[in-house]
């Protein structure tokens, strides 16, 4: 006979990600033993919340709690019930309710209230629901790639915990109401506001990050359907043969499109617009959306924002993979340079609608903005963020790394549940339970 | 070819309680939610509410709770639908309907694809 | 809880006609889907996300809207259209169905 260990006992964390568009909730799993580890913290499952974001419901917040709860049944399912009492559970909202927020106060707080009355009902430890800023969204999602790609520490064969010589991933977020680009940087930030230090096991950390609102892919589209509206009279990123009827009301309700906003309008008003499958007049359209006039700082993004120039690898995902993704394997056009990736925009503002829907069989669903979302993409990554093609050729566009979704919701776990502590690890021994 | 198999018709007195059943054949059963949605005589249709087939979650429409409970048996690739303290307003068509999807930039977006045939249920003493 | 108001509630077509049928909310919705039932059978899906086109469905039958304003439009009528339509939301729960449009043929 022979011992056999029986494997740790896990524990569990919850997070809903309250986005602009849609909810998902991750459940995260760990073992009780290990921790402080990095790396060791795994997606155990997820669930995609019907309907819109919490945010669309700022008339109706009861009916945002009602549709978490499929969801949250499933994580009564998911969870080990002797793991119920003691896992924590958080929802973080996004750019959606930040919006909300700033035209909208009470109805935030309202759609905040119900929803902590709904998750307050289930067994788990709750420990709140709130809205994150920018800032937060950005560096939470630095944090969740850099964990799961184990850049902070790793177990060396000798058994020590050793910092890998490799240094840490940029991470870039494109969300439906906002973009976050965040980077480990050496020299201070100009602005204070987008500079966050971090002490992450035993290791300073002088990160650049800044939250973009209103450049989420659906805002974007918003404005650029304004842009369309009061410009042309029809829509040049959408494809030749497809129209559509388009509620002004709709168009201009977001703080987003108030700068484009007719000052007499009827917001009952439709207006039939149509596509023209015009690459460059797209192009245009999209980078009207970009300022570059003036800049208080020694160096910019766009719209007078300080960056310092990208450096190092950087990780894109959720729009920014999806986008790409889309024209890789979709469209089957090759993307690994920039020129390559505004070859594939240009290609795909050009289809027809019956080209489009021809060569897309299967996934029409909104496949109209594509053509805008490839455009505004490769126009952020090249104008706003000052990718060249040699800093363009670190970047991946990636959903999950080691089976978990990349995005705020992990890195946001570890920090509140002090996963990551601040001081480095003593010497351990690692115990294989294979 | 999918298939929602749902049976004619049941006449219950009023205050009783009926169970009707959907038969899936054609796809993975526990692949899809299964939804219930009511047609009242000459009236439009009502969402009562869904069940995860996977982990036995269930989601009602609020005017539904209490009325509705649904159920499977993965075995057999059936939902269920129980209805109590049946009223005259209770008497319609109750549909069974398997829930689509697509993505979209990683969203899910979701519809009713196929349908049962429908079962009637006439509350009557 | 979204409200949705089809109209007409019955529309008289002759065969050959282009037509419209249409689906107000009460509130924004990010997309509508389209049901067709036909007399004494279950609901057929026809057009999901506002427009697009379910699988069999003829090319004569298109969707467009946005906002609170949805539309179905049949180009060119034909028999086998007569029949009940209904506009259908999944924005925000709890899920809704207009009261319908029954499209006759003269």
């Known amino acids: 006979t022979r011992d056999v260990r029986e494997p740790p006992a896990l524990k569990y964390g919850i997070v809903l990600d309250a986005g602009s568009s849609h909810t998902s909730m991750f459940i995260y799993k760990w073992p009780a033993d290990k921790e402080n580890d990095t790396g060791i913290v795994g997606q155990h499952s997820s669930c995609d919340v019907p309907g819109g974001g919490i945010s669309s419901y700022a008339d109706n917040p009861s009916g945002a709690s009602q549709s978490l709860v499929g969801c949250l049944e499933q994580a009564l399912q998911d969870v080990p019930k002797e793991r119920h009492a003691g896992t924590p559970l958080y929802l973080g909202a996004t750019a959606g309710m930040r919006l909300l927020n700033l035209t909208n106060p009470e109805a935030s707080t309202s759609v905040l209230m119900a929803v902590t009355h709904t998750l307050t009902q289930y067994p788990f430890d709750f420990r709140g629901a709130r809205i994150l800023s920018g800032q937060e969204e950005g560096v939470f999602g630095w944090v969740t790639a850099n964990y799961l790609l184990e850049n902070f520490i790793k177990y060396g064969w000798v058994g020590r915990w050793f910092r890998p010589r490799k240094g840490t991933l940029g991470a870039m977020d494109l969300g439906g109401a906002s973009t976050q680009i965040t980077f480990e940087t050496t020299s201070p930030a100009e602005d204070r506001a987008s500079e966050v230090q971090l002490h992450l096991y035993g290791q300073h950390y002088r990160v650049y990050t800044h939250s973009f609102l209103c450049y989420g892919r659906d805002q974007v589209l918003q404005r650029l359907l304004a842009s369309a509206l009061q410009t042309h009279g029809f829509h040049p990123c959408w494809p030749r043969g497809f129209s559509t009827q388009v509620l002004l009301g709709d168009v201009y309700q977001s703080p987003c499109t108030m700068a484009q906003r007719p000052q007499n309008f009827n917001s009952s008003a439709r207006v039939s617009l149509s596509g023209s499958s015009d690459p460059h007049l797209c192009r245009d359209l999209v980078s009207g959306l970009f300022s570059f006039s003036s800049c208080p700082f020694s160096r910019c993004s766009f719209n007078g924002v300080f960056q310092p120039p990208v450096a190092g690898n950087f990780v894109a995902f959720s729009a920014f993979f999806y986008t790409v993704d889309f024209l890789r394997t979709s469209m089957g056009l090759p993307v690994a340079t920039l020129q390559q990736l505004e070859a594939a925009a240009v290609n795909v503002c050009n289809q027809t609608w019956a080209q489009l829907q021809a060569r897309v069989p299967g996934q029409r669903a909104r496949l109209a903005d594509y053509c805008a979302g490839a455009m505004f993409v490769q126009q952020l990554l090249s104008r706003g963020y000052g990718f060249d093609e040699r800093a363009f050729g670190g970047v991946i566009f990636q959903k999950k790394a080691a089976d978990t979704a990349v995005g705020w919701a992990l890195g946001y776990m570890l920090n509140l549940t002090n996963l990551i502590p601040a001081d480095p690890p003593g010497l351990r021994k690692g115990t294989d339970f294979s | 070819e999918v298939q929602l198999q749902q049976f004619g018709a049941e006449l219950v007195k009023p205050g009783a309680s009926v169970k009707i059943s959907c038969k899936a054949s054609?796809?993975?059963?526990?692949?899809?939610?299964m939804d219930w949605v009511k047609q009242s005589h000459g009236k439009s249709l009502e969402w009562i509410g869904d069940?995860?087939?996977?982990?036995?979650?269930?989601s009602y429409n609020q005017k539904f709770k209490g009325k509705a409970t649904l159920t499977v048996d993965k075995s057999s690739s059936t939902a269920y639908m129980e209805l109590r303290s049946l009223t005259s307003e209770d008497t319609a068509v109750y549909y069974c309907?398997?829930?689509?999807?697509?993505?979209?930039?990683?969203?899910?977006?979701?519809?009713?694809?196929?349908w049962g045939a429908g079962t009637t249920v006439t509350v009557s003493s | 809880q979204i409200v949705l108001t089809q109209s007409p509630a019955i529309m008289s077509a002759s065969l050959g006609e282009e037509i419209t049928l249409t689906c107000s909310a009460s509130?924004?919705?990010?997309?509508m889907h389209w049901y067709q039932q036909k007399s004494g059978t279950s609901p057929k899906l026809l057009i999901y996300?506002?427009?697009n086109l379910a699988s069999g469905v003829p090319s004569r039958f298109s969707g467009s809207g946005s906002g609170t304003f949805y539309s179905l439009t049949i180009s060119s009528v034909e028999a086998e259209d007569a029949a009940d339509y209904y506009c259908?939301?999944?924005?925000?729960?709890?899920?809704?169905f207009g009261g319908g449009t029954k499209l006759e043929i003269k």
């Open positions: 054609g796809y993975t059963f526990t692949d899809y939610n």
């Open positions: 309907a398997r829930r689509g999807f697509f993505l979209y930039y990683g969203s899910s977006y979701y519809y009713f694809d196929v």
């Open positions: 509130s924004s919705v990010s997309y």
């Open positions: 259908h939301q999944w924005s925000s729960y709890p899920w809704t």
């Open positions: 069940i995860n087939p996977n982990y036995d979650i269930t």
């Open positions: 996300s506002t427009s």
